[in-house]
């Protein structure tokens, strides 16, 4: 069982209530994904500076931030919904001693699907989190249309169709 | 808020479904959760369901099988519990984890008896 | 799935002392961790998530610090209202995904 006994608090000395309060928090929806609304508490907390970053189990740690590696393989929209649930998103690749760190724990030579994606909205490639891809750094391969996503190979970064089916990373 | 309906007294073997209704917000990409708390003891979670386009399902290993969550609406989701036993009697809460970058239960139902 | 223990069985305090609770995960769940308090009759409300971060409302006598597998919950300054049952929660997030409680310790508030 995943329950023991719980931890109960008894005051002898009068009664006491307490008035529940809930807080409620939205979602936003962007290109057929949903993309999380983050309150100004969660950003706050989200790296306090006397907080280690610390990764669960199956994720590894780099640089303060966690990466799950798939061993399955499915759709861009479907590894991007898988990442979501697990409340993370498709990798998003910052540097290139990133993708350094990346490459270095694919243990294979085929596509990996990261948090890239071309919006026919803004007519660019665009990361997960709505930042522009840096051109300075990264050049992608292939063409950039409709329906084109991006997946990393041999830390290269190809455009590819949506709908192909590779293994992808979560991060958080 | 959140309301939890179905609670009865059931025989042994029987099944029952209980459901879980919202007001207030509508199912989006929240998960909404089952979990129980018999008779003095501890909460025990039963399993959620991704309410997203997904509706992905994940259950504790004990519940699979017996227990299923569904989405019926965008402000209801069922429990359907079959082969009860007295084991099975309890407060059966359903609960929201809160729809951002963390995990958190930050919405709850008062909770329906179930008792076999 | 993983397993969460809280411990310990039972601890007395008095009016405004100080009580920690205690919680182990069987494996690293980060910082997923969340803190229930949950009086008789009524459903469990959040204190804490994050394993440290407050919920809105919830005062600062309460705080909670950890990751990995090893988890605290400490309330200081007890007050008559601190009087309920808390509950930690973990959550595991890889390929499948599970929400564990664990229990505890029973407090009596002199």
């Known amino acids: 069982l995943l329950v023991s006994q719980g931890v109960l608090l008894k005051c002898q000395k009068g009664s006491c209530s307490n008035a529940t309060q809930y807080e409620d928090t939205g979602d936003l929806k962007v290109n057929n994904g949903t993309r999380r609304n983050i309150s100004n508490k969660d950003l706050c907390a989200s790296r306090s500076a006397d907080q280690t970053v610390l990764c669960q189990s199956e994720w590894l740690k780099y640089q303060g931030k966690c990466y799950w590696f798939s061993n399955e393989m499915k759709s861009w929209s479907d590894s991007y919904v898988y990442c979501l649930e697990r409340k993370s998103h498709l990798l998003i690749i910052h540097d290139q001693l990133e993708m350094a760190f990346i490459q270095k724990n694919l243990r294979q030579l085929n596509y990996v699907w990261i948090g890239l994606n071309f919006t026919s909205l803004k007519m660019t490639w665009t990361w997960v989190d709505g930042s522009p891809i840096d051109s300075k750094i990264f050049f992608i391969k292939g063409p950039a249309k409709e329906n084109s996503c991006a997946a990393i190979k041999e830390s290269k970064i190809f455009s590819e169709t949506c709908s192909s089916v590779f293994k992808w990373i979560c991060q958080y | 808020s959140l309301e939890e309906s179905g609670g009865d007294l059931v025989q042994p073997e029987g099944s029952l479904t209980l459901t879980c209704t919202a007001s207030?917000?509508?199912?989006?990409?929240?998960?909404m959760c089952w979990v129980r708390q018999a008779p003095g003891k501890g909460l025990e979670w039963i399993g959620c369901i991704y309410t997203g386009s997904s509706g992905s399902t994940y259950y504790a290993s004990w519940a699979k099988g017996r227990f299923t969550i569904t989405k019926t609406s965008s402000t209801t989701v069922t429990l359907q519990m079959t082969s009860l036993t007295a084991a099975d009697t309890a407060t059966y809460f359903c609960?929201?984890?809160?729809?951002?970058?963390?995990?958190?239960?930050?919405?709850w139902g008062p909770g329906t008896l179930v008792t076999v | 799935d993983v397993v969460m223990t809280q411990t310990p069985a039972s601890v007395e305090a008095a009016v405004g002392g100080t009580v920690t609770i205690k919680c182990q995960a069987s494996?690293?769940?980060?910082?997923?961790l969340s803190w229930y308090q949950q009086k008789p009759g009524q459903p469990p409300k959040l204190l804490i998530y994050t394993a440290y971060t407050l919920e809105s409302g919830v005062p600062s006598r309460f705080k909670g610090s950890g990751s990995g597998t090893e988890f605290t919950l400490t309330i200081s300054d007890l007050e008559c209202a601190d009087a309920a049952t808390y509950y930690c929660q973990g959550t595991y997030r890889s390929s499948s995904i599970s929400w564990p409680f664990g229990g505890g310790t029973e407090v009596v508030v002199k």
């Open positions: 494996q690293s769940i980060g910082s997923d």
């Open positions: 609960a929201r984890d809160a729809g951002t970058t963390y995990w958190r239960y930050n919405i």
């Open positions: 207030g917000f509508f199912f989006s990409s929240y998960y």
